[in-house]
Structure formats: C-alpha cells, structure tokens
C-alpha cells in the first residue's frame, strides 16, 4: 500500500545525519523501476532541505536537528514515478510530528508585577494574577507546564506567609488576616515559575503588593481639651483650632476630618469647619455671645471622617472651655425710636418727655444724655434723667424743620465704661396742631376796572389743620365796605371781592378780615389797583397818573 503512518521525530536529535526515518515503497516497483521524491515545506520549499528521500530506495532522510518550537509538524507529499517520468501513484501525505524536549525555561511576562489590596481584607481575597510562559509543549508533555510558587516575602510582618499563589493560575491571594497599611504599606514577593509542573527549570520575578487604605483608624484629638477667650457680641470670631491626628492616608476621605458640636451649644452660637489643608477644626462664633447672660460655655466636639469607618471604632471627643469676655456695650435707647405727641407752641421749659437708655452691661454704669441733632434748637435734654424739655417754640407749621407734622430729633446716651460707649435714639415729636394761624387770602394784590368790574376771586389758606380751617368767614373793616363787598363761597375756601361803587383810577387798600372755623381772625390788607376801563383788566391802560 502506498501509505505511511505519521512519523514522530524528537527535536534536537543528535544524528548522525542524514538520519533514516522511514521508507516510502510503492508495490508498483514489481512491474517497473520506481523513482521516489518528496515535496512540501521542509523539502523543496522553505525551509528547504530539512528532509530528503533516497531516489531509488525511497528512504526518507532527516538532514538536521529539528526545533519543535519553530515547526512542530511537517506536512510533505511523497511521489512515485516510473523511468519515463509517469506518475505511478497518487501523491501520498507524509506527516512528520516533532516531539518536544524540555529545552526552554519558563519566562515571566513582566519583571515586576504590581497589584493592590485593601487593608484588613479576609483571607481568600484575590490580589492579582501573574503569568509566565514556556515555549515547550504543555499538552502532550509536562515540559511546558508551569507551576507558580512564592519564594519569599518582604517584609515578613506580621508574619512571612501573608499571601499564597495558585500553583497553576498564578493568582495571588491573601492567606492570612492582619494586613495593616499603617504598619506595612507594601509587600515585595519573589515569585517563581517552574516547568515540568514544578519539577523542572525555574525562573523568578517580583510581585509588589500595595496595601490600600481603609478607614480603620479614627481621628484623635490632640489635645483633647482647650481653653479659649472670646469677646462677647463677636460674630465669625475664631475661637480655637482643634487638632486631630489620623493614621489613615493623608488627604483621603478616610483621613479628612468632619467635626460636630455634640453638646454645650444650646443657643446654636458656635460653628465648626474643617481646614482644607491642615485638617484642623476651626471653631468660630455663629452668633454673638452675651457675657451678661452666660460668661462661660463648655463645648463638646466629636470628630469622624468623611468616609465611614470600616469597623466599629471609638470616636474622639474634645472639650472646649470658652470664657466669654465682657465688652463695654453701648447703651440702648428703649425704644430705639420713640414717638411722642406734643402740642405745638408749648411754653419754654415745659417737659416734652423722658427718653432713657438701658446698658446691657451688668455693672451699674452711669448713663449721661445729650441731644445730638435738634435742627431748630427747640429742645434740651437733662444729662442725668433723660428729661426732654422745650427751650424754643415748637411750630408745627415750620416747613423748614417739620415734615408731615413730625419733628425729628436724635439723642445720645454715653456710659462711663472704659472706654466709654455711646448709643443713639430717635425722638419723633408728633406736633399737635393748635389754632395759631388765621386764614390768609391769595393773591393780595388785585387789578380791577372801575366800569363793569369783574369779581375778584381770592383763595383762602390757613396753615393750621382741620378743624382750625374752613369754613372761613370774611368781613371788610375800616370803611372798606363802602366801596367793596366780600363774600365767602359755598365751600368756604375762597372769598369773592367786588367793587360796588365807582372809584377813580388809583391804588386803594382794602381791609379784609378773615376768620377760620375756630374763630381765629386774621386782618389782611389787599392792595387794589383801580383802572379806568371796562370789564376785565390785568394792567391799567394809558399813562399812569396815580399818586
């Protein structure tokens, strides 16, 4: 039969070469002389000349040692031809399998492997995987089967078997409890890879295991107690910086401190923030403290971390004794703005009101008073009692100083502290109207024709308030009623002046008496220019000859 079973040839053969492997034989050689040849990679194509065949005998020859790691199998074709070159057989498939020798050591894929694991993890936790390769065969032989092992561990704390490596997968795992970043932040393992499944050649590499931080350390106050002095009334005042130590990784959430006032701040007077760089707790006043109400506060502050604790840890507490310093506080007028009703025009020396201040300080400080702003100079204030009296005539109708019936005065109180402090109060005098102004006509100069004169309408004004105003009454005096009439309109707020007899062109005084609803009378002289004209006129026509 023109068939050859697969041929196995060990790699790295010693020879001698050429080495006979197998004989090709066609049964057609009984009839005719047969010539044998081979083709294929390793014969007539690259790598050429590895194999040859004795042309007449059919012996398959190996010309040099084989390398399985280069070519593990050769597929050749055997040919049989007669003397005339005619093919006597179909090409025959020749498989040459190169069998493995353990001629390669394992090689790690990296010189140094890096991995990490959280501190405090349980045994069995996977850390990392290392890999070594071996070019030898690992399917049919153990030549390329790599077994992994840990040769050494540095440091050997808390003991020298903190990790294990899976002998076939290269997975490094934690085998013992006690990984503590704060004691050992990094382990260096010398790892081995050995072929022949652990019985052959060995190579080494390094695995560096970084121990990652977990929040397994509570921040601790150092010191745990503080004494501070704070001025009363100060807001945003730094009271104290609280210092903590934390063994966890700096600037990590497990290290960054969070402060909480646990007790002693009943009035919510204090606040505490974390300094972003130093991690200190900055205790400041959120509201002003009151020495007179409470001169000492004892605060209790607890510290934790931004990250939660990974195990139950006792929290550290600090005590801060805050002495509140007495500050000489300004007297405060009660009320800060005082409204007092007073009649205008009260006699000089008449009391207006008593306006006093209270001193928040507990010592019996003496308070003295004075007027700070009195635009019209109408008032005086007793420095000891705070009694305000009239020293000028209070005039409601004084438009320069009085707005909407109110006269505004600013007063000052000063204590005898060291240094002295002052407080101000506003006194708003609501001036009650008295009927101290009579009605006044407007305008007080008129021009009128002596023939068919037009009635002159004069507006009546009274600076007083109702009921000391309209309805008004009008009366002509000093014989003015011989030539003139004066009548108040129905609304009672204007007076109509009429010329009832002919007067020659000239200027005349009309004596008009107006009285208000409270019978306050005001005599006004109206200057009347009479012109030689008819009806309405604004100025006299023609040359003026009046005297």
């Amino acid at each position: 039969d023109w068939v050859v079973a697969p041929i196995s040839v060990p790699e790295n053969g010693k020879g001698p070469f050429p080495q006979r492997l197998n004989q090709l034989k066609s049964n057609k050689d009984r009839d005719t002389k047969i010539f044998y040849s081979i083709t294929g990679p390793g014969a007539d194509s690259p790598p050429e000349g590895v194999f040859a065949v004795e042309k007449e005998t059919g012996w398959l020859l190996l010309n040099k040692p084989l390398d399985r790691e280069e070519i593990a199998k050769y597929e050749l074709f055997g040919h049989a031809v007669s003397e005339n070159g005619a093919s006597v057989e179909d090409p025959m498939n020749i498989s040459i399998i190169v069998t493995d020798q353990n001629d390669h050591k394992p090689k790690f894929t990296q010189d140094t492997f890096r991995g990490s694991v959280l501190e405090g993890v349980l045994p069995g936790t996977s850390v990392m995987q290392v890999t070594a390769t071996d070019e030898d065969d690992a399917i049919y032989t153990y030549n390329g089967v790599v077994a992994y092992s840990i040769h050494s561990q540095e440091p050997k704390d808390p003991h020298d078997l903190m990790f294990t490596i899976h002998r076939s997968t290269g997975t490094i795992s934690v085998i013992s409890s006690g990984l503590d970043r704060e004691k050992v932040p990094e382990y260096t393992l010398t790892i081995q890879a050995t072929d022949m499944d652990g019985d052959g050649s060995t190579t080494t590499a390094v695995a560096v295991v970084e121990i990652l931080d977990a929040n397994d350390n509570a921040p601790m106050f150092d010191p745990q107690k503080y004494e501070a002095h704070v001025p009363e009334n100060a807001v945003g005042h730094e009271v104290q910086r609280l210092t903590v130590t934390d063994l966890d990784a700096p600037n990590s959430p497990a290290w960054r401190a969070t402060y909480l006032i646990m007790g002693g701040d009943d009035g919510d007077h204090f606040t505490i923030t974390t300094h972003p760089e130093s991690n200190q707790g900055i205790l400041t006043t959120r509201k002003g403290l009151d020495f007179e109400a409470k001169n000492q506060h004892t605060l209790y502050v607890e510290v934790t971390n931004e990250a939660p604790f990974v195990l139950k840890l006792p929290t550290s507490t600090a005590t801060i004794v805050v002495h509140v310093e007495d500050v000489n506080e300004a007297p405060v007028f009660v009320p800060p703005s005082k409204v007092v009703e007073v009649q205008e025009g009260i006699p000089t020396g008449e009391p207006v009101c008593v306006y006093t201040a209270e001193d928040p300080d507990k010592e019996n400080q003496k308070i003295s008073y004075r007027i700070l702003r009195d635009p019209a100079g109408w008032l005086a204030m007793d420095p000891d009692s705070g009694q305000v009296t009239a020293v000028g005539t209070l005039d409601r109708e004084d438009e320069q100083f009085v707005r909407n019936n109110i006269y505004e005065v600013m007063v000052l109180a000063m204590d005898n502290g060291s240094p002295p402090t002052t407080g101000t109060g506003t006194l708003l005098l609501t001036l009650i109207d008295v009927n101290d102004h009579g009605p006044v006509p407007e305008p007080r100069q008129i021009t009128i024709c002596n023939q068919s004169p037009v009635r002159q309408v004069l507006n009546i004004t009274d600076k007083d308030l109702s009921p000391h105003t309209s309805p008004f009454q009008a009366q002509l005096t000093d014989d003015s009623d011989i030539y003139w009439t004066a009548e108040v309109n129905e609304e009672g707020d204007t007076v109509v002046l009429s010329l009832k007899k002919f007067l020659k062109q000239d200027t005349y005084d009309v004596h008009l008496s107006l009285s208000d609803h409270g019978n306050k009378e005001q005599l006004t002289v109206i200057r009347a220019t009479v012109c030689d004209c008819h009806g309405h006129v604004e100025t006299c026509p023609g040359p003026w000859k009046g005297g």
Epitope: P223, A228, H229, P231, E238
Partner: antibody, heavy 118, light 103 residues
C-alpha cells in the same frame, strides 16, 4: 486682685529633680488653666505646657514631654511643675501664667530661677 | 509646629522716632499676641488679637498684620518703651513665642 506667687530661686544638683510651685489667689482657681513658660538667660520664651485645675488635664509641648510633669493641689490653689533628670540646659527662669482677656497670658508669676550646678 | 521669627533681633531708636518690628510665621495664624519684658521682670501682656492694646498700654503702640506677617509699631518712641518684645500665637499647639526683638 489676681496673683500668682512663685519662690524666687532653687539651686539643684545635676541628675536630680525639682518641684516648682505657683500659688494662685484672687480668682476661682478651677476656672482658668495654668501655663508654664521657660526662659533661659539671654534666650526667648518657651511654652512648656498647660494644666486645667478643674480636672488635672495636661497638655505638653513635645520638647518637654518626660522632662516636665504638671500637677495641681486644689485645696491650696497651687500648681506644681516637677522637672526631672536636671542638666545645665535646665538652668532657667520658669514662669507660671494664667490666660485671660483676649487669650493673652494676662497674669504671670515672678518666676523661679532654677540653677543646676554640682 | 509653627515657628515665629522676629526681626530685627536688636534695634535702637531715639525718642520721638517711629519704630516698627515684625514677626513672621512659618504658616498662617489667625491672630498674633505681643508681650513686653524688661530685665528682671516677668513678661507683660501688650497686644492681643493682632491689634488690640492690653489694659494700660499707651496708645502710641499699635499692632497689625494677617496670615504669616505681623508687626508692632510705636508711633513715637519714648524712653520707657525700651524693652524686649515677644510675639506669640495661641490657636495652634504648641503655643510658641518668637525669639524677641530687643529695643
């Protein structure tokens, strides 16, 4: 008025220890902390530590841990500082002080001159 | 710890002159405190919280500064002001003093 009284001087031998006193009067002794300050001749001031008379809580400057020990006797309103293993470096004036207005060391004792000499 | 450096270490002045001495901190502090000491006497509180004069301190003295740089100024030197002045910080432990400026 507030007073802190200290003895004027102490002469001690090297290797021994000395206990300095600071007697307070004129205020409630347990309400304010007592501080201790060292001043070597021609040198500046060094804060040693502090003690709260209300509960004997102490806090030391690291440079003086093991060297100084602060204690209190409430019954006599007296603060004490013991200095151990004395050497010539410990020859100095030691002041006690009390904090007050403005966080200042407002009240100071007159100081005790400690001379360490064989 | 925070180190306070005072400069100059020694200075002299005539009556009526303006005097300024400085205190530099290795890291930021909120307030600075100053003491005056004369030979044979205990230190006296002089300036608190950077700029406030302690009781009985003449108004010719003033204090200023922030962060890491502070100073004490005498507007018009008088003979009684001759002394050593120490700066101190309070809020961060350990409480430290500067080396002093001898005026």
């Amino acid at each position: 008025q507030v007073q802190l009284q200290q003895p004027g001087a102490e002469l001690v031998k090297p290797g021994t220890s000395v206990k300095l006193s600071c007697k307070s009067s004129g205020y409630t002794f347990t309400s304010y902390w007592i501080h201790w300050v060292k001043q070597r001749p021609g040198h500046g001031l060094e804060w040693i530590g502090e003690i709260d008379p209300s509960d004997n809580y102490t806090y030391y400057n690291q440079n003086f841990k093991g060297k100084a020990t602060l204690t209190i006797d409430k019954s006599s309103s007296t603060a004490y500082m013991q200095l151990n293993s004395l050497t010539s470096e410990d020859s100095a004036v030691f002041y006690c002080a009390r904090s007050g207005y403005g966080n200042l060391f407002v009240y100071w004792g007159q100081g005790t001159l400690v001379t360490v000499s064989a | 710890q925070i180190v306070l450096t005072q400069s100059p270490a020694i200075m002299s002045s005539s009556p009526g002159e303006k005097v300024t001495m400085s205190c530099s901190a290795t890291s930021s502090v909120t307030y600075m405190y100053w003491y005056q000491q004369k030979p044979g006497s205990s230190p006296k509180p002089w300036i608190f919280r950077t700029s406030n004069l302690a009781s009985g301190v003449p108004t010719r003295f003033s204090g200023s500064g922030s962060g890491t740089s502070y100073s004490l100024t005498i507007s018009s030197m008088e003979a009684e002001d001759a002394a050593t002045y120490y700066c101190q910080h309070y809020h961060i432990y350990p409480r430290t003093f500067g080396g002093g400026t001898k005026l």
